[in-house]
């Protein structure tokens, strides 16, 4: 059923109730849009920085990747760890932090084809919804092989990131995933999510752009920790 | 800023029917699309319907396909959510969001629909 598959890792990693971030080169994600509930188009997210038992890597945060926490560690017990760093050793692209992948084991800085894995599935649609086309006619959302050569402009269906065009990162859209605008600064980002907190990640959102980060805003500072503001700012 | 506005909830018998309606003022960039979501106490909030402007396409939850249609007009900036053969487990507050260019996402107040048996 469609609420089996919002609690499932097929769509994941957002705070409810809409999406998260698609993940990024080059900075820490913009995962949801802020964790946003209902309320005055208020935004309000939430951190946990306990450690989170995990299953896989697309159920810690965008700067984080699941591993067991000691060397040789029980294999059975694993938690989100912080991301690492550029040149240091790595045995996959998820444990490089965001701007960096996995290259002859050692974290690299990515260019612009490359991207974390998060939004880097191929996303299905059979979610056991129902997706009618407005027109009434069955319209196929995978990308003809010309996409491939011209990127993709705003709106446009998408499979990754690289299949977009230059200020734009593949992100969801309903069940879909469409080319959307890269964060710029100011705008409003998440980081930290949880599975606790994933839901409805119907409404995806890129990272930060190019020398951005996601960051508390320092006004928000005095908030409760489950409302702070987070925003994309210059490293 | 983008506000969303919802009405026409309400209280109303079971097998009977409602329409939501969700407007949206202050739009400066264009929209993708637009969902309706509920949220009933003691449970998580739910993905009801949607419709994607970009795609052309609706979406459904399999708990309202066959009773509940979305429809609505991108260049008015409004959605709506035509409820038929409710039931009382529809009984909730149904929010409006929209996923927008500018790269924020917005949702409305809510609106409460009950449905008595």
């Known amino acids: 059923t469609l609420n089996s598959v919002l609690n499932s890792n097929a769509i994941k990693n957002l705070p409810p109730p809409l999406g998260g971030a698609a993940g990024h080169p080059g900075s820490a994600v913009s995962a949801a849009p802020g964790i946003l509930y209902p309320g005055g188009n208020k935004y309000q997210t939430i951190d946990n920085y306990q450690p989170y038992p995990c299953a896989e890597d697309e159920e810690c945060g965008t700067d984080e990747y699941c591993a067991s926490p000691t060397r040789g560690g029980d294999a059975g017990v694993q938690i989100c760890l912080a991301c690492r760093k550029r040149r240091k050793r790595c045995m996959r692209h998820a444990m490089c932090c965001p701007g960096n992948y996995c290259k002859n084991g050692i974290c690299v800085s990515s260019d612009q084809n490359h991207f974390r894995g998060e939004i880097e599935e191929t996303i299905t649609e059979s979610f056991g919804n129902d997706h009618s086309t407005l027109d009434g006619y069955s319209r196929r959302t995978t990308l003809s092989s010309k996409m491939y050569h011209t990127k993709g402009q705003e709106g446009s269906v998408c499979l990754r990131s690289s299949d977009c065009a230059s200020g734009l990162c593949c992100a969801r859209h309903f069940w879909s995933k469409i080319c959307k605008p890269v964060l710029k600064e100011g705008q409003v980002c998440t980081k930290h999510r949880r599975k606790g907190s994933h839901g409805l990640e119907i409404f995806q959102r890129c990272y930060c752009g190019e020398g951005l980060s996601c960051r508390i805003q320092k006004d928000h500072h005095q908030a409760s920790n489950s409302s702070r503001l987070h925003t994309c700012q210059r490293h | 800023e983008v506000q969303l506005v919802e009405s026409g909830g309400g209280l109303v018998r079971a097998g009977g029917s409602l329409r939501l309606s969700c407007a949206a003022s202050g739009r400066t960039f264009s929209s993708y699309g637009m969902g309706w979501f509920r949220h009933a106490p003691g449970k998580e909030r739910e993905f009801v319907a949607g419709?994607?402007?970009?795609?052309?396409?609706?979406y459904y939850a399999d708990s309202v396909k066959g009773r509940f249609t979305i429809s609505g007009d991108n260049a008015k900036n409004t959605v709506y959510l035509q409820m038929n053969s409710l039931k009382p487990e529809d009984t909730a507050v149904y929010y409006c969001a929209s996923d927008e260019s500018d790269a924020a996402n917005y949702w409305g107040q809510g609106t409460q629909v009950t449905v008595s048996s």
């Open positions: 419709i994607s402007w970009t795609l052309g396409r609706t």
